[in-house]
């Protein structure tokens, strides 16, 4: 027999199947051109000294063989003597170590058995009514296919599934979607309605994330506010990585979980933009404002649960940096300017009240004045900080106010609003004898003392009503008592107390008259 022909004689080895576990398997045969055919198979076991024979039986009952030698692939033409338009039965016999091993048979019509490809190129994955939908372009000239899929998770073996018959230029498959674990999918195809046609190879892995992206388990820390009025947000703990099935480890497009950082600046609500979303890897600098920070995890199916933190405002105050002058036309604040063309946000809120009650004002971009100061003025009619109470003031600055992460804190301080000099007047001044020539003067704390850093000192004035001599005694802002000594018995005195701020002299309290009684000796 010629090697190119199927030999219609008995093969050159005894006809006996050893029934061993090794041997030929997975025989596939198909047409590869208008007149050429190919069969290929796998051989399990030691390959040394193995000879393979492709056997073929025609519908007439006549059988022939091709000698393939040690190869596990064989090509032949339509001139080889094999009927290609009618059904034939093919199998492989492998002769090794004086025994014959047989593959399972395949029965097919060779002419219409086309080598089907698995889905090639881009397999689009989407979610449809709680299931996974895969879609791909049908390989060229291969419309009409049966499609199967197999899938596994990191902890489960392959499971087989059926996509059903396909008959279009695009093919698709509905597959199960796992809620919380990643899956690896592979697809294969075979010719539709062709008896005994072989399955294609499995496609490349399609890696699919869980329906719910994992909740980010991260922790943040915030550094101290620096000289530039900014503090760094740092990630203390990276998000945990998703466990992947074997074929998705390494490069696994499709299973990526992206973590985004959403910043919401709570302070200074009058600015243009309050929120900004960043990649988690790019940790921002923040001003000393209060922020809410959310980490949002998302995959190709959309966002998952987020984790939210509150970053409180930095309450470190600069008691001297802010100058406030109160005039008849209104009030003006002065502070050291940051740079040219800066926008400032001045925020104030009554102390001890909810942060939601903060009020703010945004300045137009301004350059420093000749003294290097920035200013903000308001009239009495505006009502800003008009009530006689303590306000917490924070000033933020930015050269790019539309960019949330470029704000910095200029200063934080306290200010007593309204008519501070009158409102701060100490009340309940009382005088008690202390000794033969001294008295103790007490008073209730000034309202200014509720405003940290605002009350510079108390001044106690004592006036001798006889000689009209006046003495003034400065008292620490934390004290509400002073001892006046060197007084004369029987002389009438008046005492008054006032509370001063750094920029404002207080109003004296109502005069309090007293005298030290003359002691009569027995």
């Amino acid at each position: 027999c010629r090697t190119s022909e199927c030999c219609f004689q008995d093969p050159p080895y005894p006809d006996a199947d050893s029934g061993s576990a090794s041997g030929p398997r997975d025989l596939r045969c198909y047409r590869i051109s208008s007149d050429r055919y190919e069969c290929s198979w796998q051989y399990e076991g030691p390959t040394a000294g193995v000879s393979h024979f492709l056997r073929c039986c025609l519908s007439s009952g006549r059988c022939c063989y091709f000698a393939a030698g040690s190869a596990t692939r064989l090509q032949f033409s339509d001139q080889a003597g094999v009927s290609v338009l009618y059904t034939v039965t093919l199998w492989v016999e492998s002769w090794a170590r004086n025994q014959t091993e047989k593959s399972p048979e395949v029965t097919l019509q060779l002419y219409n058995s086309v080598k089907y490809e698995p889905p090639l190129g881009d397999i689009k994955v989407s979610k449809l009514a709680g299931q996974l939908r895969m879609e791909w372009e049908t390989p060229d000239n291969q419309v009409g296919a049966e499609v199967q899929f197999r899938h596994r998770t990191p902890s489960s073996p392959w499971k087989l599934g059926d996509c059903g018959p396909q008959d279009d230029d695009t093919e698709s498959c509905l597959c199960p979607l796992e809620m919380n674990v990643a899956q690896e999918f592979q697809l294969r195809r075979r010719q539709l309605g062709s008896q005994g046609s072989s399955w294609s190879k499995w496609s490349s892995p399609v890696c699919v994330p869980p329906e719910n992206p994992p909740q980010p388990q991260v922790r943040f820390s915030v550094e101290q506010l620096g000289q530039d009025g900014r503090r760094r947000l740092t990630l203390k703990e990276q998000p945990t990585q998703l466990e992947l099935p074997e074929g998705c480890q390494g490069l696994a497009p499709g299973t990526e979980v992206t973590y985004r950082l959403q910043l919401h600046m709570l302070s200074c609500p009058c600015k243009a933009k309050a929120t900004r979303t960043l990649h988690l890897g790019k940790m921002p600098y923040l001003s000393g404002a209060a922020y809410n920070v959310a980490v949002i995890s998302s995959n190709q199916f959309g966002p998952g649960l987020n984790q939210t933190w509150h970053i409180p405002a930095d309450t470190h105050t600069e008691p001297v940096a802010l100058n406030i002058s109160v005039g008849t036309n209104g009030t003006t604040m002065y502070w050291p300017a940051r740079a040219q063309s800066m926008t400032y946000c001045i925020e104030w809120q009554p102390v001890g009240q909810d942060g939601g009650l903060a009020t703010c004002s945004l300045t137009a971009p301004q350059d420093p004045d000749p003294a290097g100061m920035a200013t903000y003025s308001w009239s009495r009619e505006s009502g800003a900080m008009g009530q006689e109470k303590c306000y917490y003031i924070t000033i933020f600055a930015s050269a790019h106010p539309e960019k949330l992460t470029l704000w910095s804190t200029v200063l934080s301080t306290y200010h007593f609003g309204g008519n501070a000099s009158a409102a701060g007047t100490p009340h309940h001044v009382s005088v008690k004898n202390h000794s033969l020539d001294s008295v103790s003067v007490d008073w209730a704390p000034s309202l200014l003392s509720t405003c940290p850093g605002v009350l510079k000192e108390y001044v106690v004035r004592c006036r001798d009503e006889d000689s009209k001599q006046v003495s003034e005694h400065p008292v620490q802002p934390t004290e509400t008592q002073v001892t006046l000594s060197g007084l004369r018995a029987g002389v009438a005195y008046t005492v008054q107390v006032r509370a001063d701020t750094a920029w404002l002299r207080g109003v004296w309290s109502q005069p309090q008259r007293f005298s030290i009684e003359v002691q009569v000796s027995d």
Partner: nanobody
């Protein structure tokens, strides 16, 4: 004597249709597999379509699948090839062939009986 005669060839426009007939005489062809082949100038004879004796099974070359249809009328001892959506590359001499051995091949030398052929020309 045994004879196969093709007819129905001619000139057609691209996109047009032709119907070829193959009449058999001299023996009963109703027991034979029948096929159409074609040969363009300077090329080898190529398989076009095949029909088994009962008309239960048909096969087509990839280049004509969906455009050509083979059929037979055993009472009239005739085989047909309906050609639609013709293309310039379909231009060739078309031959009718018979395989009494039912071998089921696309190789022209396996066929025992042949007609003289009919010319089909498709102009663009």
């Amino acid at each position: 004597q045994v004879q196969l005669v093709e007819s129905g060839g001619g000139l057609a426009q691209a996109g047009g249709s032709l119907r070829l007939s193959c009449a058999a005489s001299g023996r009963t062809f109703s027991n034979d597999d029948m096929a159409w082949f074609r040969q363009a100038p300077g090329k080898e004879r190529e398989f076009v379509a095949h029909i088994d004796r009962n008309a239960a099974s048909t096969n087509y070359a990839d280049s004509v699948k969906g455009r050509f249809t083979i059929s037979r009328d055993n009472a009239k001892n005739t085989v047909y090839l309906q050609m639609t959506r013709l293309k310039p590359e379909d231009t060739a001499v078309y031959y009718c062939a018979a395989d009494p051995d039912h071998f089921g091949t696309t190789w022209y030398q396996q066929y025992t009986y042949w007609g003289p052929g009919t010319q089909v020309t498709v102009s663009s």
